[in-house]
C-alpha cells in the first residue's frame, strides 16, 4: 500500500495505490483511491507512467480527456466514471502487454488540494493448474497442467503423507511455448503415486503462486486449485 500526500500551496490530499500484477492478454486494474470531493467537475485524475512521455489517462471536468494520451495506451484505458465521485480513481487496462510493467503515478487534484502515489505494476502470465490421474501411463502417474505462465516458473510437488519429501527425482517438468511466443504451457508429471494420499503441484514465479491439489482414494478423486498473486502491496 502506498499512501501519497500533496505538497502544493493548497492542502494535500491522501492518495492510496496498491501494487498489483497484470496477466498478459487479459484486462488489468491499477488501483487508486483518494479523499472524495462533492463536485465531480472539480476532480482531475491523471495517470502517468515512468519513462512514457504522454499520459496514460486523464479524467477532468467529469469526462475523459485523452488528447495527450500516449500512443501505447490508445483505446486501452478507462476509469470507472461513476465511481470517481466517491474517490475511486482506479484505471482499467485492456489487453495487458509485457511492456505495461513499470512504475505508474496516480495524480489527483480536487477542490481540497493535490496528492499523488506511485504504483508498481508487474506483468506476466499465470493460470490455474489442473491435476489429473494419467491413466495412459504404465504406473500410477499424476499430470499437472497449467496453460499460461511467464516468466518461466518453478514446479514443486508435495504430498500430505510424505511431508518434506523431495519429489524432483520422480517427477518430470516441461515448458511448451504457446502460439503467441511469450507465455508457456507448464506440464509436470509425477510418477510412483500411491493411493489414499493428497498430492500438490505448486507452480510459482515472481508474480504468482498457484497450487493444484488432488486427493486419490480407492473410491474417488477430489481436486482443488488455488492461485495467489505475490506482490499486492499497498502504498
Amino acid at each position: 500500500l502506498i499512501i501519497g500526500f500533496g505538497i502544493s500551496g493548497r492542502h494535500s490530499i491522501t492518495v492510496t495505490t496498491v501494487a498489483s500484477a497484470g496477466n498478459i492478454g487479459e484486462d488489468g486494474i491499477l488501483s487508486c483511491t483518494f479523499e472524495p470531493d462533492i463536485k465531480l467537475s472539480d476532480i482531475v485524475i491523471q495517470w502517468l507512467k515512468e519513462g512514457v512521455l504522454g499520459l496514460v489517462h486523464e479524467f477532468k471536468e467529469g469526462k475523459d480527456e485523452l488528447s495527450e494520451q500516449d500512443e501505447m495506451f490508445r483505446g486501452r484505458t478507462a476509469v470507472f466514471a461513476d465511481q470517481v465521485i466517491v474517490g475511486n480513481a482506479s484505471l482499467r487496462l485492456k489487453n495487458v502487454q509485457l511492456t505495461d510493467a513499470g512504475t505508474y503515478k496516480c495524480y489527483i487534484i480536487t477542490s481540497k488540494g493535490k496528492g499523488n502515489a506511485n504504483l508498481e505494476y508487474k506483468t506476466g502470465a499465470f493460470s490455474m493448474p489442473e491435476v489429473n490421474v494419467d491413466y495412459n501411463a504404465s504406473s500410477e502417474t499424476l499430470r499437472c497442467e497449467a496453460p499460461r505462465w511467464f516468466p518461466q516458473p518453478t514446479v514443486v510437488w508435495a504430498s500430505q503423507v510424505d511431508q518434506g519429501a523431495n519429489f524432483s527425482e520422480v517427477s518430470n517438468t516441461s515448458f511448451e511455448l504457446n502460439s503467441e511466443n511469450v507465455t508457456m504451457k507448464v506440464v509436470s508429471v509425477l510418477y510412483n503415486v500411491t493411493i489414499n494420499n493428497t498430492y500438490s503441484c505448486m507452480i510459482e514465479n515472481d508474480i504468482a503462486k498457484a497450487t493444484g491439489d488432488i486427493k486419490v482414494t480407492e473410491s474417488e478423486i477430489k481436486r482443488r486449485s488455488h492461485l495467489q498473486l505475490l506482490n499486492s502491496k499497498a502504498s
Epitope: K63, D64, L66, E68, D70, A78
Partner: antibody, heavy 119, light 107 residues
C-alpha cells in the same frame, strides 16, 4: 445528445480518391475515438480504421496503403480519405463512436453515406 | 486477423419465441464482443457491449453472455420489431472484425 453525420458520398470513378467527413456533436473528439466501418451492398460490416483522441490512428492492414483518417478538433469533424478506388469499394461508409474509452463496442453511428465506384 | 463465425446465418422464428445466436472467435477475445441489430437501409444499433452489458435503452429481453471464444446473444421473447439482421463484433485486437450476420425472419 451524441450525433455523427457523414457527408461526401456519391459516385466516384475507379482509380480516383474519396474524401468523407464525419461531423460530430454531443461529445468531444478529445475524449473518444472515432471508428470507420463500411458495408458493401447485401454484405456484412467491415472495420476500416480509427482515429484516437490524441490524433493517432490505427488502420485495417488491408487498407493501410490507401487510407488516411484525420480530424480537426476545433471543427468537431473527422475526415476519411481513401485513394485508388475500385468497384469493390462500393459501399455505405459509416463513422461510429465507441461506447467506452476502452472500446467495448460502437454505441453511436452516423446514418451512413453511399459511395458508388463506377465509370 | 481474428475471425468471428456467427451461427446460424439465417433463422425463422415466431413472435414470442426464444432465440439464441452464437458467435465463435478464432482466438480468445476476453469479453470484447458486442452485438448489433441492423434493419434494411439503417445503421447498426448497439445492443450488447463487453459481452454481457446491455446498452442504454435496449429492452431487457436482449441478453449477452460468454467470454474467451464463445459468445451468445439471446432474445427471450421475440417481438415484431426484432426481425432484423444481427452482427457480433470483436474489439479486442486489430483489425476489429465482425461476424457475417444472422438474418432473423418471421416464420
Amino acid at each position: 445528445q451524441v450525433q455523427l453525420v457523414e457527408s461526401g458520398g456519391g459516385v466516384v470513378q475507379p482509380g480516383r480518391s474519396l474524401r468523407l467527413s464525419c461531423a460530430v456533436s454531443g461529445f468531444s473528439l478529445t475524449s473518444y475515438g472515432v471508428q470507420w466501418v463500411r458495408q458493401a451492398p447485401g454484405k456484412g460490416l467491415e472495420w476500416l480504421g480509427v482515429i484516437w483522441s490524441s490524433g493517432s490512428t490505427d488502420y485495417n492492414a488491408a487498407f493501410l496503403s490507401r487510407l488516411t483518417i484525420s480530424k480537426d478538433n476545433s471543427k468537431n469533424t473527422v475526415y476519411f480519405q481513401m485513394n485508388s478506388l475500385r468497384a469493390e469499394d462500393t459501399a455505405v461508409y459509416y463513422c461510429a463512436r465507441d461506447v467506452t474509452t476502452i472500446v467495448e463496442g460502437f454505441a453511436h453511428w452516423g446514418q451512413g453515406t453511399l459511395v458508388t465506384v463506377s465509370s | 486477423d481474428i475471425q468471428m463465425t456467427q451461427s446460424p446465418s439465417s433463422l425463422s422464428a415466431s413472435v414470442g419465441d426464444r432465440v439464441t445466436i452464437t458467435c465463435k472467435a478464432s482466438e480468445k477475445v476476453g469479453t470484447y464482443v458486442s452485438w448489433y441489430q441492423q434493419k434494411p437501409g439503417k445503421a447498426p444499433k448497439l445492443l450488447i457491449y463487453g459481452a454481457s452489458n446491455r446498452y442504454t435503452g435496449v429492452p431487457s429481453r436482449f441478453s449477452g453472455s460468454g467470454s474467451g471464444t464463445d459468445f451468445t446473444l439471446t432474445i427471450s421473447s421475440l417481438q415484431p420489431e426484432d426481425f432484423a439482421t444481427y452482427y457480433c463484433g470483436q474489439t479486442y485486437s486489430y483489425p476489429f472484425t465482425f461476424g457475417q450476420g444472422t438474418k432473423l425472419e418471421i416464420k
